[in-house]
């Protein structure tokens, strides 16, 4: 079924939103970001079997062709469908300033 939400691989195995706690050092941002000092990064992780959360017709085709030709056609990838904005306090040449990043945190996920 298109945009199916049943995961045949078992709970938590398929494409879904996960939160990973990361420090500025983990992200390689310590030299230019001042706050937050730790980020709750929401990201899309998991497999994309069958028609699970297929984003569009192209993703459905990709799934079908991957079953037929797994060496040629990769499986769909779990990626953000939309994002939450986040503000960073950062160092610049002219001093400390605010910058909002619209595509920093995943809001929900699909397979594409």
């Amino acid at each position: 079924a298109r945009n199916g939400d049943h995961c045949p691989l078992g709970p938590a195995a398929c494409c879904a939103l996960h939160t990973v706690r990361a420090s500025l050092e983990d992200l390689g941002w310590a030299d230019w970001v001042l706050s937050p000092r730790e980020v709750q990064v929401t990201m899309c992780i998991g497999a994309c079997p069958s028609q699970f959360r297929a984003a569009n017709m192209h993703a459905q085709i990709k799934t079908s062709l991957h079953r037929l030709k797994p060496d040629t056609v990769p499986a769909p990838c779990c990626v953000p469908a939309s994002y939450n904005p986040m503000v960073l306090i950062q160092k610049t040449d002219t001093g400390v300033s605010l910058q909002t990043y619209d595509d920093l945190l995943a809001k929900d996920c699909h397979c594409i």
Partner: antibody
Framework: QVTLKESGPGILQPSQTLSLTCSFS??????????VGWIRQPSGKGLEWLAN???????YYNSALKSRLTLSKDTSNNQVFLKISSVDTADTATYFC??????????WGQGTLVTIS | QIVLTQSPAIMSASLGEEITLTCSAS?????MHWYQQKSGTSPKVLIY???NLASGVPSRFSGSGSGTFYSLTISSVEAEDAADYYC?????????FGGGTKLEIK
């Protein structure tokens, strides 16, 4: 360009409830890490932090005033509201709202003077 | 709550003089902000997180400190620096401000 503007009743009588509105533009309370804070300043005196409301609707209050303070927000209309119950003359002050980014009062409104008498 | 004590309460300085304002915390804090408030206006940030100059702030301002003792230095005072200066901590709630230092220019 970030702007904030406070509005209030101007003059209020003791024991009444003070209702303040902060109307802002140039940022969104849907943004992670963003909040609005309230600070007051009696004439000729220092700054006193009152409360913060955050993007995720978390609210933090000055413990000395917590029982009298109520914070709320209307994210779609870019407004934050502060109510202070049972006011007395000690609540006479200029009330500021400010954009908070994580831990920083980055931009401030011009303030609104409230007199309790 | 963490009490911030600023000294001196009032400081008078001559043009071109280097001055230092101090802020002492009743408990250790990780960082300190400094705000400037000129007469009849709202405060604006000068120093973010102890030592980082906010955008647009002249380089004659600098901050330092750690633990319970923090300071704001103006390397060469100018007439436009006449204002009230407040330290501010957010290491723990309730967030608190110092009582302020009023800088007057001779």
């Amino acid at each position: 360009q970030v702007t904030l503007k406070e509005s209030g009743p101007g003059i209020l009588q003791p024991s009444q409830t003070l209702s303040l509105t902060c109307s802002f533009s140039g940022f969104s309370l849907n943004t992670h890490g963003m909040g609005v804070g309230w600070i007051r300043q009696p004439s000729g005196k220092g700054l006193e932090w009152l409360a913060n409301i955050w993007w995720n609707d978390d609210k933090y209050y000055n413990s000395a005033l917590k029982s009298r303070l109520t914070l709320s927000k209307d994210t779609s209309n870019n407004q934050v509201f502060l109510k202070i119950s049972s006011v007395d003359t000690a609540d006479t002050a200029t009330y500021f709202c400010a954009q908070v980014a994580w831990d920083w009062f980055a931009y401030w409104g011009q303030g609104t003077l409230v007199t309790i008498s | 709550q963490i009490v911030l004590t600023q000294s001196p309460a009032i400081m008078s300085a001559s043009l071109g003089e280097e001055i230092t304002l101090t802020c002492s915390a009743s408990s250790s804090v990780r960082y300190m902000h400094w705000y400037q408030q000129k007469s009849g206006t709202s405060p604006k940030v000068l120093i973010y997180s102890t030592s980082n100059l906010a955008s647009g702030v002249p380089s004659r301002f600098s901050g330092s400190g750690s633990g319970t003792f923090y300071s704001l230095t103006i390397s060469s005072v100018e007439a436009e620096d006449a204002a009230d200066y407040y330290c501010h901590q957010w290491s723990s709630y309730p967030w608190t401000f110092g009582g302020g230092t009023k800088l007057e220019i001779k």
